[in-house]
Each structure stands twice: as structure tokens, then as C-alpha cells.
Amino acid sequence: LQDLCSNCPAGTFCDNNRSQICSPCPPNSFSSAGGQRTCDICRQCKGVFKTRKECSSTSNAECDCISGYHCLGAECSMCEQDCKQGQELTKKGCKDCCFGTFNDQKRGICRPWTNCSLDGKSVLVNGTKERDVVCGPSPADLSPGASSATPPAPAREPGHSPQ
């Protein structure tokens, strides 16, 4: 005997109480594939969660996080508190990045500033809690008499405007 349930499309379930008739999923439930014997219950996006996509008969609701929080985990299963740039989230809340570290986002952890000297370069712009250091040419490149790929601009004498 052929299983009549395989004919039931997404958005329905195979109702054994009614001789394997395909019945529509009840409100607040869905079936995303055909041939289902039950419909799945819709996820609820409440509290810190907000609805990004309403539940339909063929697909589950999709949640997002309210302002001040960001999604974590598969399908936004959790909402984590945002921090300011220059901070990281600890068990005791948002804390400023320690000296020598930075975070340029509202989430994640503080990361160490780039060590320019490891690449043989010098620090062009100092780092802050919110921004990494900017590395520039190596100290040797900046020393007097060092060769340069582009010739230096002609120096102006003080007090003279260009002709």
C-alpha cells in the first residue's frame, strides 16, 4: 500500500485521524517539507527578541534582537548585550579595553594592538581603546639619507611663497 503521506505538501501534515488526508498546519505551526506527520510549533520572538520574519504555514519565524543587543548562535538563538567601541563584555557587564588592546565593534573582545616592529615597521598613529595602531615605514626608511621610491618634494625656504 502506497504511503499517501508522501503526497502531502509543505504547509500541511498527514492526518492519521482522518485516513491520511493532508490537513493544513494549525495556526502557530508550520511544516517546511512535504510528507510530515505533524507540524512544528512556531518559535516565539518575545522580550529581547523581535520578529524578523513572521511564521508561515511553510516556514518558522525568524528572530532578531532588539536595539542594544546582537544575535549569537545559529538562527539567532541568543541575544547578547552590545557594548560601546573600546569595550568588551565580561560577566560583570561592559568593561573598557585594557591599555594595549582595542575593540572597534559593539561586540566581541578587546584585541592587542598590532606590534609594528614584528613587521620591521614603526608606529605611525598610536592605538586607542577603539582603534588599532597604524604602522608606517620602517625606522630605517625614515632615517636621513635613506633611499625612497619617490623623490622628496623640494623644500621651501621659510618666508617664501611658491612662484
Epitope: 512556531c42 518559535r43 529581547v48 543587543y69 538563538s77 541568543m78 541575544c79 547578547e80
Partner: antibody, heavy 121, light 111 residues
Framework: QVQLQESGPGLVKPSETLSLTCTVS????????WTWIRQPPGKGLELVGY???????SYNPSLKSRVTISIDTSKNQFSLQLNSVTAADTAVYFC???????????????WGQGTTVTVSS | QSVLTQPPSASGTPGQRVTISCSGS????????VNWYRQLPGTAPKLLIY???QRPSGVPDRFSGSKSGTSASLAISGLQSEDEADYYC???????????FGGGTKLTVLG
């Protein structure tokens, strides 16, 4: 199997602060809404408020000015503080888990056994 | 005054079918699933029905729930003496941003 256990003083004087703690065992407190619900003698259930592991809180508007719920994920505990109590705050206080905060659809599905708090001088 | 409205009492004889109603508004029952809880004296409420009509494992199929518009109902068929308890409906309220409850219905099994 997640279990919840309320603890705190059973008697509080009027105008003082009611403080209760709920300890969660057999599961993580990270995720879910952790809820306080109360039931005055012979009456129905009333939501006091809830907290999410990341610190988000929501309180019953009728109690909002007096209530604070906090969470300590390292101890798997959450707590209730209710200020300036009166005899009307006498109730059984239940802590409970709400899985709407954990990708779920059951709602308030796990309850502590409740603790009776009497406000009297 | 509870946000959701239930009759304070209901009764039936063993084997009978009884229903308990629960009335709300568009911000709660009208827009959100309904749960039902059963509470025996001196104990915590126990989830009986979730998402309008779903039974958690261990709850007998004598208990069924339904919802229409801003009202919901709990039906208990084949009434038994141990069904004597308080029954509460509950739903998330979008305006209050939290759960609201009915005032409870005390079910008495006669005879």
C-alpha cells in the same frame, strides 16, 4: 532535568525590602528568561518580572518602581528585590523558566516549588 | 483584577466533559499562543497545555485546548476525581511585554 529552588526570608516588615534568590540546577542559566511570579493567598498568578542571561529585564508595570531582578550566571542564580513592601505583597513567590528566551515555544515550563513571604510587623 | 478572564468555578461528575473558558484581548490571546496550567493545593502550577493545543509529554489526551480570536478554552473529558484543582490560562501580552494570567478556575468533581 532543570530544577529551581527559591530561598530567602519568610517574614519581612512593612516598608522594608523583600529579597529572594532562585538557584538553577541541572542546566545552564545562559539562555531562557528567568521569571518571578507571585500568588497572593487565595488569589491568582501575577508576573512580577523576568531577566535574560545577558541582563535584559522586563517588569510588571504595577510593580516597576519597586522591583529589581538581577542575575549571576557564574553562580547559576537570579534574584528578586522588592522595595517598600506592604501587606499586599504577602504571597507565595515562584521562580520559573520561560523558554521564549531560548529559541522555544513552551513558555513558562519549569517552576520552583514556591516560597511564602509574609509582610507583617 | 486579572488581565485574562476565567470563570471562578466549574464542576462536573466523574466521566463527564467540562470546559473552562478564558477571554483576553488582541494584545494577548488574539495575537499569541495560550498556555494552560493546573495547580494542586500547596504546589506550583504545572504546564498542562502549551501553544493553544499541545500537550507536554505525560499529560493524558483527556486534556485538550483550543483558541478562537481573543478567547481560548480548556476541555477535560472523562472527568476524574484527581482532576479537582485550580486551572489557569496564560498568554504573552505584547503591550505589557510579559506573561499575563487568568484569575483561575476552581474545578470541583462532584459525587
Amino acid at each position: 532535568q532543570v530544577q529551581l529552588q527559591e530561598s530567602g526570608p519568610g517574614l519581612v516588615k512593612p516598608s522594608e525590602t523583600l529579597s529572594l534568590t532562585c538557584t538553577v540546577s541541572g542546566g545552564s542559566i545562559s539562555s531562557y528568561y528567568w521569571t518571578w511570579i507571585r500568588q497572593p493567598p487565595g488569589k491568582g498568578l501575577e508576573l512580577v518580572g523576568y531577566i535574560y542571561y545577558s541582563g535584559y529585564t522586563s517588569y510588571n508595570p504595577s510593580l516597576k518602581s519597586r522591583v529589581t531582578i538581577s542575575i549571576d550566571t557564574s553562580k547559576n542564580q537570579f534574584s528578586l528585590q522588592l522595595n517598600s513592601v506592604t501587606a499586599a505583597d504577602t504571597a507565595v513567590y515562584f521562580c520559573a523558566r520561560d523558554d521564549y528566551g531560548g529559541n522555544g515555544y513552551y513558555g513558562v515550563d519549569v517552576w520552583g516549588q514556591g516560597t511564602t513571604v509574609t509582610v507583617s510587623s | 483584577q486579572s488581565v485574562l478572564t476565567q470563570p471562578p468555578s466549574a464542576s462536573g461528575t466523574p466521566g463527564q466533559r467540562v470546559t473552562i473558558s478564558c477571554s483576553g484581548s488582541s494584545s494577548n490571546i488574539g495575537n499569541n499562543p495560550v498556555n494552560w496550567y493546573r495547580q494542586l493545593p500547596g504546589t506550583a502550577p504545572k504546564l498542562l497545555i502549551y501553544s493553544n493545543n499541545q500537550r507536554p509529554s505525560g499529560v493524558p489526551d483527556r486534556f485538550s485546548g483550543s483558541k478562537s480570536g481573543t478567547s481560548a478554552s480548556l476541555a477535560i473529558s472523562g472527568l476524574q476525581s484527581e482532576d479537582e484543582a485550580d486551572y489557569y490560562c496564560a498568554a504573552w501580552d505584547d503591550s505589557l511585554n510579559g506573561w499575563v494570567f487568568g484569575g483561575g478556575t476552581k474545578l470541583t468533581v462532584l459525587g
